[in-house]
């Protein structure tokens, strides 16, 4: 039948490998040649190749020793197909159960277990639990069943059976009375764990049982009076270490000290903590002390333990006299950050503000001032009076130095103490806008058709703030209004430039004057390229002599150089020639316009 009973394979097999386990056999092999295969983890999926099957014979083989502690059971599928690959049987479950061998010793979870119990406790008191694990099977065999025992106890006082261990749980408990910390503060037990429920392999570990002290000794100050000197203003400064002695177990809650300031610190200037190693009380400043306000503090410190006293005990108190040492304190600007409104462009030498500092010290120390950081170099500061004046032109529109209308300056005050100390202040100048910028059109170069031209919309920008901005006004100058019109839109923030008369294809200067709401005027020359075309245009079509062509030849480069030279010469000539000469281009354009009209009429 096409069924295989679960196959049991002992772990750690010695081989040799491949080792035969079972033969898969289909009774369909009478009719046709059968080919066998297996699938599943351990065959064709990880861990691959542990098991294999001979294709023609159906023999199931084991290729390596198994480890039950790694994989305890393999679930494979056996397949049978005919020569043409057609399945002749349903996949068959093959269960391979790895049977356990006692190949692991018990292992304690720790080399050394630590537990504690109060001195004088009654027998039966639980101390601690130890644990040993064994990777072997503890369900179907005793291979992994662990039994605990105590092998030895040191010291053997008052006798050698002070503790017992539960055979199966590993719980150690007190079995005899007489635990006395003053005589024996610690016991060392050698414990054993044995598998096969006590009949197999043994491993050992150590259990250290600390006998805890009852808190029957109060900590005592040694000495009881302290005197300390502390510089003023320092936070976190160690004032004094207070030492105590305690007869209880070192580093136990009954020995560890807890300190409290019980008097003399009405201003909450001090704090006291316990040093984790020395158990001293470390008195430190929580706030800076002020010599000018109080030059001496007398503190009262009380000490107790972390653990409450087991019996009624007197609490020790120490006195600490703290002398405050005077320190030269830094001048302090008032306020630390000063905001001043000042108009941009004020004349050089004009006062901006007075910015001074105060010295916390009692002596009347002399304070001198200087500018520490003035990125644009616009200000000066009088060293004696703290008077800040303008030495450069304050420019609100200078984007390099001014952010959100604010110019930030850092100033320094220095006293004449020994050693001298310094303090800094921040001066924030809020620059008030002045109408010092005229409106400017964008772009300043346009290309336009000379037939059915499209209106050119230019944006108007003004660096100033309202009300020194829009609405803007536009006016054409230098006879540019003969051929062009300029109109500001309703919102007053764009100007529309239109060609109103025919001009031949060429480049022209359009003189546009823009003024803002505060009548600040700015003349801008718009470079207009007029093209022989209709409607909208980006660049002039056809052979255009006015610009540089796209040629890549040497001749083209020479031509460009020639044009540039001519342009420079022409520029010089333009500066010399009169307005009439400048109008010649427009007059020729008029003649050409009339010629065009004449041609159209003849046509």
């Amino acid at each position: 039948d096409w069924v295989v009973a679960p196959i049991s394979v002992p772990e750690n097999g010695k081989g040799p490998f491949p080792q035969r386990l079972n033969q898969l056999k289909s009774n369909k092999d009478r009719d046709t040649k059968i080919f066998y295969s297996i699938t599943g983890p351990g065959a064709d999926s990880p861990p691959e190749g542990v098991f294999a099957v001979e294709k023609e014979t159906g023999w199931l083989l084991l290729n390596k020793p198994l480890d039950r502690e790694e994989i305890a059971k393999y679930e494979l599928f056996g397949h049978a197909v005919s020569e043409n690959g057609a399945s002749v049987e349903d996949p068959m479950n093959i269960s391979i159960i790895v049977t356990d061998q006692n190949d692991h010793k018990p292992k304690f979870t720790q080399d050394t277990f630590r537990g504690s119990v109060l001195e004088g406790v009654l027998p039966g008191t639980s101390v601690m639990q130890v644990t040993a694990t064994d990777e072997d099977d503890a369900i179907y065999t005793y291979n992994g069943v662990v039994a605990y025992s105590i092998h030895s106890q040191e010291p053997k006082d008052p006798h050698d059976l002070m503790f017992t261990i539960h055979r199966s749980t590993g719980t150690i408990s007190v079995i005899s009375s007489g635990l006395d910390r003053e005589k024996v503060p610690e016991y060392t037990l050698t414990i054993q764990a044995t598998d096969m429920d006590g009949d197999g392999s043994t491993t050992t570990a150590v259990a250290v049982v600390e006998i805890l002290d009852a808190n029957d000794n109060a900590p005592m100050f040694e000495p009881q009076k302290y005197e300390a000197w502390v510089p003023e203003n320092e936070v976190g400064h160690e004032v004094q270490r207070l030492t105590v002695t305690d007869l209880d177990v070192p580093n136990s809650p009954a020995w560890r000290a807890t300190y409290h300031i019980v008097g003399g610190d009405d201003g909450d200037h001090f704090t006291i903590t316990t040093h984790p190693e020395t158990n001293q009380g470390v008195l430190t400043t929580k706030k800076g002390l002020d010599f000018e306000a109080q030059d001496q503090h007398t503190l009262y410190v009380e000490v107790t333990n972390e653990a409450p006293f087991a019996v009624k005990l007197p609490t020790a108190t120490a006195t600490v006299v703290v002398h405050v040492k005077d320190v030269n304190e830094a001048p302090v600007f008032v306020p630390p950050s000063k905001v001043v409104e000042v108009q941009e462009g004020i004349p050089t030498g004009e006062p901006v503000c007075v910015y001074t500092a105060e010295d916390p010290d009692k002596e009347n120390q002399k304070i001198s001032y200087r500018i520490l950081r003035d990125p644009a170099g616009w200000l000066a500061m009088d060293p004696d009076s703290g008077q800040v004046t303008a030495v450069g032109t304050l420019d609100r529109e200078d984007e390099q130095f001014v952010r959100n209308n604010i110019y930030e300056v850092m100033v320094l005050a220095m006293d004449n103490g020994s050693p001298p100390t310094t303090g800094t202040g921040t001066l924030l100048l809020t620059l008030i806008d002045v109408n010092d910028h005229g409106p400017v059109p964008e772009p300043r170069q346009i290309t336009i058709c000379n037939q059915s031209p499209v209106r050119q919309v230019l944006n108007i920008t003004d660096k100033d703030l309202s009300p020194h901005t829009s609405p803007f006004q536009a006016q054409l100058t230098d006879d540019s209004d003969i051929y062009w019109t300029a109109e500001v839109n309703e919102e007053g923030d764009t100007v529309v430039l239109s060609l109103k008369k025919f001009l031949k294809q060429d480049t022209y200067d359009v003189h546009l004057s823009l003024s803002d709401h505060g009548n600040k005027e700015q003349l801008t020359v718009i470079r207009a390229t007029v093209c022989d075309c209709h409607g909208h245009v980006e660049t002039c079509p056809g052979p255009w002599k006015g610009g540089s062509g796209g040629g890549g030849s040497g001749a083209g480069v020479i031509a460009v150089i020639v044009v540039v030279v001519i342009a420079i010469v022409a520029g010089i000539v333009v500066l010399v020639i009169s307005r009439k000469k400048r109008m010649a281009k427009y007059e020729k354009a008029e003649i050409k316009e009339m010629g065009e009209m004449h041609r159209e009429l003849n046509a």
Partner: antibody, heavy 118, light 107 residues
Framework: VQLVEESGGDLVKPGGSLKLSCAAS????????MSWVRQTPDKRLEWVAT????????YYPDSVKGRFTISRDNAKNTLYLQMSSLKSEDTAMYYC???????????WGQGTTVTVSS | ELQMTQSPSSLSASLGERVSLTCRAS??????LNWLQQKPDGTIKRLIY???SLDSGVPKRFSGSRSGSDYSLTISSLESEDFGDYYC?????????FGAGTKLEIK
């Protein structure tokens, strides 16, 4: 018909290396364990190495462990034996043999001669 | 290492005669034993696997058996092609080990 044919045998100096090949045909090579066996000049047969069908696991006697490596290429239906640190006692006729019916040494090749001599 | 002691080391027999070869295992190997035949040209062939199972194509005059730790190969009636060397090999314990061989000659 199941056929195995060895090649690669040669004369090699002590300490040298050599790689033997065994080409298989006539059976599904990839599902059978394969071994190398050698026959010394005094006619004694000695098992040299075995490899599992998928090539994941290999086994050697102590006499060759660490010096010889058995491997296979199931795509090429070929078994290999890489021999290094050769000694004069490795002189033998080397045969490759397949498992069949879960049992070793079912089908044998003609053998290839390895001579280790200075 | 498990030892396979093969006897006799050589044997002369006549055609038609019944002969038996023996291998003794120094430890238990169960039924994990094969018998091999080597012809004078060096060709090796497996005759018997698992102590007593006959390989396909092997004449029925060959048979294998076991008695305790002794394993036998019997040829019921010798034929001319049966002459050559015969080896046992165990695979019940690692490493696999061979008998020293028996040379079967024509008398």
């Amino acid at each position: 018909v199941q056929l195995v044919e060895e090649s690669g045998g040669d004369l090699v100096k002590p300490g040298g290396s050599l790689k033997l090949s065994c080409a298989a045909s006539g059976f599904t090579f990839s599902t059978y364990g394969m071994s190398w066996v050698r026959q010394t000049p005094d006619k004694r047969l000695e098992w040299v190495a075995t490899i599992s069908s998928g090539g994941h696991y290999s086994y050697y006697p102590d006499s060759v462990k660490g010096r010889f490596t058995i491997s296979r290429d199931n795509a090429k239906n070929t078994l290999y034996l890489q021999m290094s640190s050769l000694k004069s006692e490795d002189t033998a006729m080397y045969y490759c043999a397949s498992y069949y019916y879960g049992s070793p040494f079912a089908y044998w090749g003609q053998g290839t001669t390895v001579t280790v001599s200075s | 290492e498990l030892q396979m002691t093969q006897s006799p080391s050589s044997l002369s027999a006549s055609l038609g005669e019944r002969v038996s070869l023996t291998c003794r295992a120094s430890q238990d190997i169960g039924s994990s034993l094969n018998w091999l035949q080597q012809k004078p040209d060096g060709t090796i062939k497996r005759l018997i696997y698992d102590t007593s199972s006959l390989d396909s194509g092997v004449p029925k005059r060959f048979s294998g058996s076991r008695s305790g730790s002794d394993y036998s190969l019997t040829i019921s009636s010798l034929e001319s092609e049966d002459f050559g060397d015969y080896y046992c090999v165990q695979y019940g314990s690692s490493p696999l080990t061979f008998g020293a061989g028996t040379k079967l000659e024509i008398k």
